[in-house]
């Protein structure tokens, strides 16, 4: 089994995979075979309203901070970035001691698997099936930027849900042979986004490839830097009763998916206020309605939030209302 | 491609139990409220009520509020509306949509699931 | 008022225009969209909020309002647009969605 396999994102397309040799081959080591598989988000990401009060998002490695000026006044809701209850630690000193004594048994019995539980694999089609058990590891959204540690194992895994459009059984993992190195340079990949990195090390070619047990690890590449902005017109409709249903393109292609947007409008002379506008909500109104508004100029600029932090804002959109007929409410049905 | 695939075509007697289905794919199904919209035979469409699979959120028409049970299961994509006890006037086509543009259009339907409630 | 009215019938001449409309008080403070049903299909949306067509829709399908009346306009229209067409928005509550009763197109 490859030894201590370690994954670093140095881009948005690209994760950088190192490892070392097995401590006692099975024979001479002829070459490494690297799958990978796109990872579905946890669920609760989609189910989460980061909109609710105290509810902070998941922390994250490359997230910028909000700025202050802009984050003043939250009439609506509070949120800010900072570590949620969500992600691991890091790992002390002591802790990496213990694990490295853990893993010199786990290598001793690994070896012992390896020996006895030898895997013959036909990669004549130059692909391999997909493993459609995805693994439970829950992962930090952290992860990518630190090292991350593999564990190898044998163990099946059990299903888990998935909320984002997975890879249909039928299409197979991409993979890479590597000859006469320790390390690959996965590219082409899509940003801010979770990857199961599969590594075996083989001792014979032909006629039949013999491989080891797998290691697995995991990794995200880095952030997009303007896929979370909102691209073209943000419109608005002024119905009867001062009604003022904002509407607005969601990012296509986000740095993992849009958590929430912000909504920051004001009157002419006034302080500017803010809404928080949830995923779910979103859903349903492809915008924001505002009502309660007093006579007079607004503009209004939005911006989207995703797993990677905020996007930047939209050009301002101005609208007038001429009267006040309705119930002072923010955010309208 | 977005698909949605309702279950087929059921017979029931009144007063019996029935649940069908549409399993969405080639989206994130959490992330789009599913609509239910009945068609009763040579009429127009009504609509039901909807629900958001993330968290199970339902809204319905007070038309149908109490009458049918609309829910998801968002591990295998799937959508519900059920029935605890069956009318004859429960005879109709039921689609489910996506509410891609939300409140203001559904974007793709299943392709209908033809209930018969008859003795 | 929750219900939304439409004239249960209209016909056109092939290659003219023709105006379907849908009434009701919440059109006041809502989007209508407007749905295309071919007999043994499910519905196909044409327009949607402030005159959107889906991709694949013709551009001869076009969305208005004004106060509690929405439109649908067909400018030239084709043998293949015969249908029923359902308009739809939210009750005045915005708690639920309503159809419109449904227009029968006939081009002639």
């Known amino acids: 089994v490859p030894l201590d396999p370690i994954s670093v994102s140095n881009s948005s397309s690209q994760i950088i995979l190192k490892w070392k040799p097995p401590s006692d081959p099975n024979g001479n080591i002829t070459h490494y075979l690297v799958f990978w598989e796109r990872q579905a988000e946890d669920s609760e990401l989609f189910e989460l309203d980061y909109c609710l009060k105290g509810l902070k998002l998941p922390s994250r490695t490359w997230s910028p901070p909000f700025e202050s000026e802009d984050s003043q006044k939250h009439n609506q809701s509070e949120y800010e970035d900072s570590a949620g209850e969500c992600c691991s630690c890091p790992k002390t000193d002591s802790q990496i001691l213990k694990e490295l004594e853990e893993s010199s048994f786990r290598k001793t019995f690994e070896d012992y698997l390896h020996n006895v539980v030898f895997v013959p694999r036909k990669t004549s089609s130059g692909t391999g099936a997909e493993d459609p058990r995805p693994s439970r590891k829950r992962r930090s959204l952290g992860d990518v930027g630190n090292v991350t540690v593999a564990v190898p194992t044998v163990a099946a895994f059990p299903n888990t849900s998935s909320t984002s459009v997975p890879t249909s059984p039928e299409e197979h993992r991409p993979f890479e042979k590597v000859v006469n190195k320790e390390s690959l340079v996965i590219s082409g990949l899509r940003h801010f986004t979770g990857y199961r990195i599969e590594l075996q090390a083989c001792n014979q070619d032909t006629p039949e490839e013999r491989c080891s047990v797998a290691a697995y690890v995991s990794a995200r590449t880095m952030p997009e830097a303007k896929a979370d902005d909102i691209v073209g017109p943000v419109t608005h409709e002024i119905f009867e009763n001062n009604v003022v249903h904002l509407m607005w393109q969601e990012p296509k292609e986000p740095n993992g998916l849009i958590v929430l947007y912000e909504v920051s409008y004001r009157r002419y002379g006034d302080e500017e206020l803010h809404l928080c506008v949830s995923r779910k909500h979103f859903a349903l109104e492809r915008g924001c309605r505002l009502r309660g508004l007093s006579p007079g100029n607004y503009s209004v600029r939005i911006r989207a939030t995703s797993l990677a932090g905020n996007g930047s804002w939209t050009e301002p959109t101005y609208f007038y209302v001429t009267d006040y007929l309705d119930v002072p409410s923010n955010i309208a049905k | 491609e977005v698909q949605l695939v309702q279950s087929g075509a059921e017979v029931k007697k009144p007063g019996e139990s029935l649940k069908i289905s549409c399993k969405g794919s080639?989206?994130?199904?959490?992330?789009?409220?599913i609509g239910w919209v009945r068609q009763m035979p040579g009429k127009g469409l009504e609509w039901m009520g909807i629900i958001y699979p993330g968290d199970s959120d339902t809204r319905y028409s007070p038309s149908f509020q109490g009458q049918v049970t609309i829910s998801a299961d968002k591990s295998i994509s799937t959508s519900y509306l059920q029935w605890s006890s069956l009318r004859a006037s429960d005879t109709a086509m039921y689609y489910c949509?996506?509410?891609?543009?939300?409140?203001?259009?559904?974007?793709?339907w299943g392709q209908g699931t033809l209930v018969t409630v008859s003795s | 008022s929750s219900e939304l009215t439409q004239d249960p019938a209209v016909s056109v001449a092939l290659g003219q225009t023709v105006r379907i409309t849908c009434q009701g008080d919440?059109?006041?403070?809502?989007?209508t969209s407007w749905y295309q049903q071919k007999p043994g299909q499910a519905p196909v949306l044409v327009i949607f909020g402030k005159n959107n067509r889906p991709s694949g829709i013709p551009d001869r399908f076009s969305g208005s309002s004004s106060g509690n009346t929405a439109s649908l306009t067909i400018t030239g229209a084709q043998a293949e647009d015969e249908a029923d067409y359902y308009c739809?928005?939210?009750?005045?509550?915005?708690?639920?969605?309503?159809f419109g009763g449904g227009t029968q197109l006939t081009v002639l």
């Open positions: 949509a996506r509410l891609g543009s939300g409140w203001y259009g559904n974007d793709y």
């Open positions: 739809n928005s939210r009750d005045s509550s915005g708690n639920y969605a309503v």
């Open positions: 080639g989206y994130s199904f959490t992330s789009y409220w």
């Open positions: 919440s059109l006041r403070s809502y989007y």
